[in-house]
């Protein structure tokens, strides 16, 4: 019996098609992606094949202003629309609390939302009770296939899921749950979740009836052969890993941003067995067109975004100095506000010793496109926000050694007055350095805020310490020469959307005026 | 639990025919194929033909095309192997065999002989 | 068609003994390759599919690898309840084709 799982992950509010990069689209032509795109595609594979499910692993919020303005409304219509088979709950749909995935999505949901591992507990478990399941089994063609959530265990360092719902360890929550399948008599069972690949894999082995496992969250991308576009392939599609029960399992995942469709092809016996599986991500590029209907239905939401960009966030009664001229030589304000906006972006108050799980920011001064002049009656818009932050990144949290922030510091002024990128604005550091040493010894001094403290200080950074810190994802992939930071990162958890947190933020102070305070020396 | 279950032996006369029928439970009989494979005493297993349940269609390896006829009946779950013109040679033990060769009948003797 | 030599046609071993059995394909089946076990009483099972899978129940004293035209089925630690006749068997293509048999018996 042969079934064919499309499936996407990490499409983050990217329903309009996309650049190449997954950034605005500008020439249509060349542009990629979107829900009208992948709808004639994935249309196309159900008139061909008999036996299909459309699966999504998480992470549709978060990532556009669509998110911002809709708030998962969007996410709902369109996959209700798209006629989704299943869904996992990722991180980022807990991002406006737990009220902000139940009313525009698990309610207007016409699809199952899967977790596992998340139990609700308190007031919030009859609330939530029954619009996320565990598992569902869902009917396909003759046969019936069982499909199971699970949602990365660190949500509440990286969302806000609130305190009433306790994120359990993946492989010990899905067991249960896969052997109650099995006594339903359901021998298919799919692990589709928000975890990242290397959990992928160790659910792959280690959950003993899990036949295939399809996942989110690293963005991984998988191929087998010439990979169609930019994207390096960390490994062949499917993965197939080895269970400790000696089983092939295939583990796949999609990248992200909507840009491929995943399509894989498994075989099963009579006994639930995978027999063969083979398939690829599909690029969704302009040779694929979109689909009227949705494409209208787009063009229709639309309208409320062009609105919402000129609308005013808040105030600022000082110069917000992103320029060129400061951000690249010196600390600039700019700099600061967006460090300040993207701690409190993360704050989590998840364990007493704590004050926060995060107190440092890294930000490439190169990253600041604009300033934005108080003179125009201080109105901080969308639009403004769009000029400052213009690449679509996201603010990414990273577990990084002493060491490799050192290392950072030091290349952020190794060429120091040529006017480059790699300048690095900050917030929760304090840095001394000394321009007048030769480059990759310039940094005597470098202070951290403490996290494990009541009252926030100061401290020498220690070489060894394993230190959390909110960047840029250009940084964390490594861009403007940040090499260390890519190769020697211990753990990298995609964020919110840079204009979102910053104007998140804006609209919660209301009035702002940050200052030049000496973060930087 | 798969289970299949074939009927008993049988004595044929050469230049006759017979029908071995097996009954399958425990699983979603119109989704998958039957493959049925012969066993002639002493010697190795050969692979006969299948046919999928759903809408009949049939694949036969070219030694038996001609000669044998698989058929199926899907309100009783059965699927049937008929092999036409016996010579002594036909003598064997007919397995009948779920998609992929998971699940076995218990086999059944065919003996060709005047 | 694909032929499937396999060998050897018989080997004698104890217990304990770690025993492979080999097939080797005419031309490439990608993992299309299933482990079958025929006691003496009649009974097949399957053991392996798609080259290196364990059937549900089997014990992990049996493995199998290979990939293209060569494959082999190892029992790491030979069983008294082990002795029996051992067949390969293709199905990448049509025909699917049988191995000959191995017969491990008792030495």
């Known amino acids: 019996w042969e079934l064919t799982i499309l499936h996407t992950n990490d499409v983050h509010s990217r329903l309009e098609q996309t650049s190449e990069d997954s950034s605005k689209c500008v020439n249509a032509s060349r542009c990629m992606g979107g829900v009208a795109r992948l709808f004639t595609k994935v249309q196309q594979i159900r008139r061909a094949e008999p036996n299909v499910l459309l699966l999504d692993a998480g992470d549709q919020y978060q990532g556009t202003i669509w998110f911002t303005v809709y708030k998962g409304a969007e996410v709902a219509h369109f996959m209700n629309a798209l006629r989704y088979d299943a869904m996992a709950l990722g991180n980022h749909e807990f991002d406006n609390g737990v009220e902000g995935l139940i009313e525009p999505l698990l309610k207007e949901a016409k699809f199952p939302i899967l977790s596992a591992n998340i139990k609700a507990k308190g007031p919030l478990a009859s609330q939530i009770s029954g619009l996320y399941l565990p598992y569902k089994v869902l009917p396909v063609g003759d046969e019936v296939v069982g499909i199971v959530g699970y949602t990365s265990k660190e949500t509440p360092f990286l969302s806000n899921p609130g305190t009433n719902l306790v994120f359990e360890d993946e492989i010990t929550a899905l067991q249960p749950e896969v052997d109650k399948l099995k006594t339903l008599n359901v021998n298919k069972i799919i692990a589709l979740g928000h975890s990242g690949f290397e959990m992928d894999k160790l659910i792959a082995q280690k959950v003993r009836g899990v036949d295939v496992v399809v996942g989110g969250h690293s963005n991984t991308f998988l191929y087998t052969g010439n990979p169609p576009s930019k994207e390096v392939p960390a490994g062949k599609y499917p993965f197939i890993v080895t269970s400790d029960d000696g089983r092939k399992v295939p583990v796949v995942q999609a990248y992200a941003f909507g840009k491929y469709l995943g399509y894989l092809k498994i075989e099963f016996d009579e006994r639930g067995n995978v027999i063969s599986s083979h398939g690829n991500p599909i690029l969704l590029n302009s040779s694929i067109p979109e689909d009227p209907s949705i494409k209208a239905d787009i063009n229709k939401w639309r309208i409320k975004l062009d609105n919402y960009s000129t609308q005013e966030l808040g105030k600022t009664i000082v110069y917000l100095d992103g320029s060129s001229q400061s951000c690249r030589f010196r600390e600039c304000n700019m700099g600061n506000l967006i460090c300040d906006a993207m701690i409190n972006n993360n704050l989590r108050h998840t364990d007493e010793m704590f004050w926060n799980h995060v107190s440092m920011c890294i930000l490439n001064g190169g990253g600041i496109r604009s300033p934005i002049d108080e003179r125009n009656n201080g109105t901080i818009t969308w639009e403004n926000l769009a000029a400052v932050l213009p690449f679509g990144g996201t603010f990414d949290l990273v577990q990084l050694k002493g060491s490799t922030l050192k290392k950072a510091f030091e290349h952020s002024v190794h060429r120091y007055g040529q006017s480059t990128g790699e300048f690095l604005q900050v917030g929760g550091i304090h840095v001394v350095y000394d321009l007048s040493r030769k480059p990759g010894d310039r940094v005597v001094k470098l202070d951290v805020l403490c996290t494990k403290c009541r009252v926030p200080s100061y401290d020498p950074l220690k070489m060894d310490e394993v230190y959390k810190v909110i960047l840029p994802n250009f940084l964390a992939n490594g861009g403007d020469g940040f090499q260390m930071i890519k190769d020697e990162l211990l753990r990298h958890d995609s964020g919110d959307q840079d204009i979102n947190v910053v104007s998140t933020y804006i609209s919660k102070m209301k009035v702002i005026y940050p200052a030049v305070e000496g973060r930087i020396k | 639990e798969v289970q299949l279950v074939q009927s008993g032996a049988e004595v044929k006369k050469p230049g006759a025919s017979v029908k071995v029928s097996c009954k399958a439970s425990g699983y979603t009989f119109t989704a998958y194929f039957m493959n049925w494979v012969m066993q002639a005493p002493g010697q190795g297993l050969e692979w006969i033909g299948r046919i999928y349940h759903n809408n009949g269609d049939t694949f036969y390896s070219q030694k038996f095309k001609g000669r044998a006829t698989l058929t199926v009946d899907k309100s009783t779950s059965t699927v049937y192997m008929e092999l036409s013109s016996l010579r002594s040679e036909d003598t064997a033990v007919y397995y009948c065999a779920t998609s992929y060769v998971g699940d076995w009948g218990q086999g059944t003797t065919v003996t060709v002989s005047s | 068609d694909i032929q499937m030599t396999q060998s050897p046609s018989s080997l004698s071993a104890s217990v304990g003994d770690r025993v492979t059995i080999t097939c080797r394909a005419s031309?490439?089946?990608?993992?299309?390759l299933n482990w079958l076990q025929q006691k003496p009483g009649g009974a097949l099972k399957r053991l392996i599919y798609?080259?290196?899978s364990l059937d549900s129940g089997v014990p992990s004293r049996f493995s199998g690898s290979g990939s293209g035209t060569e494959y082999t089925l190892t029992i790491s630690s030979l069983q008294p309840e082990d002795f029996a006749t051992y067949y390969c068997l293709q199905y990448a293509s049509f025909p699917w084709t049988f191995g000959g048999g191995t017969k491990v018996e008792i030495k």
């Open positions: 031309q490439d089946i990608g993992d299309s």
């Open positions: 798609a080259t290196s």
